[in-house]
């Protein structure tokens, strides 16, 4: 004979656990239904009545199956140095990430709390380590034989051009200038 299907709420077997998408209610001492993402518990279960769920209100969400009495508040609107990469819905929080040219100086669980502009390496310095979503650019002085003549968060030190005859020798912030030889 097939095992009898238990409908919530039900008392679990001694030492047993509740099924997926159920929780053990310590007051009712029953296995009761959780609420799906986008909803919350409006009425907790009793020994004879199951959990009653309700939709999250505007600007609130639940991402997981839950039995919370209130949905979580979505984070505040994204600031001017950020872009909204995920909107606030009943099932997910708003996610703000830094716009191009910026990195996250202070992160939060999802997205970024505080963005900062990526460092620009001045002439004579090139990018040693590029900026990422969560780290700033690292600059380094251009080594002999290399140069950077820009103020940039992306340019690396480039080798001087090789001349047959050098008119002006290159340095860390300027390329070499070659003499043009006439035929």
């Amino acid at each position: 004979l097939p095992a009898q299907v238990a409908f919530t709420p039900y008392a679990p077997e001694p030492g047993g656990t509740c099924r997926l998408r159920e929780y053990y209610d310590q007051t009712a001492q029953m296995c009761c239904s959780k609420c799906p993402p986008g909803q919350h518990a409006k009425v907790f279960c009793t020994k004879t009545s199951d959990t009653v769920c309700d939709s999250c209100e505007d600007s609130t969400y639940t991402q997981l199956w839950n039995w919370v009495p209130e949905c979580l508040s979505c984070g505040s609107r994204c600031s001017s140095d950020q872009v909204e990469t995920q909107a606030c819905t009943r099932e997910q929080n708003r996610i703000c990430t830094c716009r191009p040219g910026w990195y996250c100086a202070l992160s939060k669980q999802e997205g970024c709390r505080l963005c900062a502009q990526l460092r620009k390496c001045r002439p004579g310095f090139g990018v040693a380590r590029p900026g990422t979503e969560t780290s700033d650019v690292v600059c380094k002085p251009c080594a002999p034989g290399t140069f950077s003549n820009t103020t940039s968060s992306t340019d690396i030190c480039r080798p001087h051009q090789i001349c047959h005859v050098v008119a002006i020798p290159g340095n860390a912030s300027m390329d070499a200038v070659c003499t043009s030889t006439s035929p």
Partner: antibody, heavy 119, light 106 residues
């Protein structure tokens, strides 16, 4: 407007049964998620939860007093009753009834009724 | 049974002060705590539920916070009408009140 009002015997003798009535208006115990509970406060002491009944007649009792308590309701009359068997001088207190929300906290209380158990 | 240890049991403060009351549960109560104000001759009045949600009509001077087994309740800018006793209630597993805090004016 939600209101609750407690009534009781005022004075009774030890070993008698203490009977309390909570009369309420502004909500119905036919409504999903509604409940009414009893709480007491002996003079100069703190609050103690006693018992609770839900819209679906599910009942909960303070484990320390469970053997002496009986809670019931008359939904049509908007009444909830509490009986405490074998009353003792330690049961002298102000008794409150309160509405309980579906998420299990008391949100509106009555003003209380004083009960003295004395020989 | 869950025990609720509320402190202090009495508190004397001046008007305009900030006062804080704490409740410690004997186990995790998952934020299921409410705070009540109780004045003589009246029924208790609900101020806060689910740790920090202010009941409609309650001034924002009242606030609550906490998680797990440790919770606190604060009154900012104490006013004369705040003189009362205050109680926490855990409703995570059945219902248990803290012992109460009697708030007086210095």
């Amino acid at each position: 407007q939600v209101t609750l009002k407690e009534s009781g015997p005022g004075i009774l003798q030890p070993s008698q049964t203490l009977s309390l009535t909570c009369s309420f208006s502004g909500f119905s115990l036919n409504t999903l998620g509604m409940g009414v509970g009893w709480i007491r406060q002996p003079s100069g002491k703190g609050l103690e939860w006693l018992a609770h009944i839900w819209w679906d007649a599910d009942k909960y009792y303070n484990p320390a007093l469970k053997s002496r308590l009986t809670i019931s309701k008359d939904t049509s009359k908007n009444h909830v009753f509490l009986k405490i068997a074998n009353a003792d001088t330690a049961d002298t207190a102000t008794y409150y009834c309160a509405r309980m929300t579906g998420t299990r906290y008391f949100d509106v209380w009555g003003t209380g009724t004083t009960v003295t158990v004395s020989s | 049974d869950i025990q609720m240890t509320q402190s202090p049991s009495s508190l004397s403060a001046s008007l305009g002060d900030k006062v804080t009351i704490t409740c410690k549960a004997s186990q995790n109560i998952n934020k299921f705590i409410a705070w009540y104000q109780h004045k003589p001759g009246e029924g208790p009045r609900l101020l806060i539920h689910y740790t920090s949600t202010l009941q409609p009509g309650i001034p924002s001077r009242f606030s609550g916070s906490g998680s797990g087994s440790d919770y606190s309740f604060s009154i900012n800018n104490l006013e004369p009408e705040d003189i009362a006793s205050y109680y926490c209630l855990q409703y995570g597993v059945l219902w248990t009140f803290g012992g109460g805090t009697k708030l007086e004016i210095k």
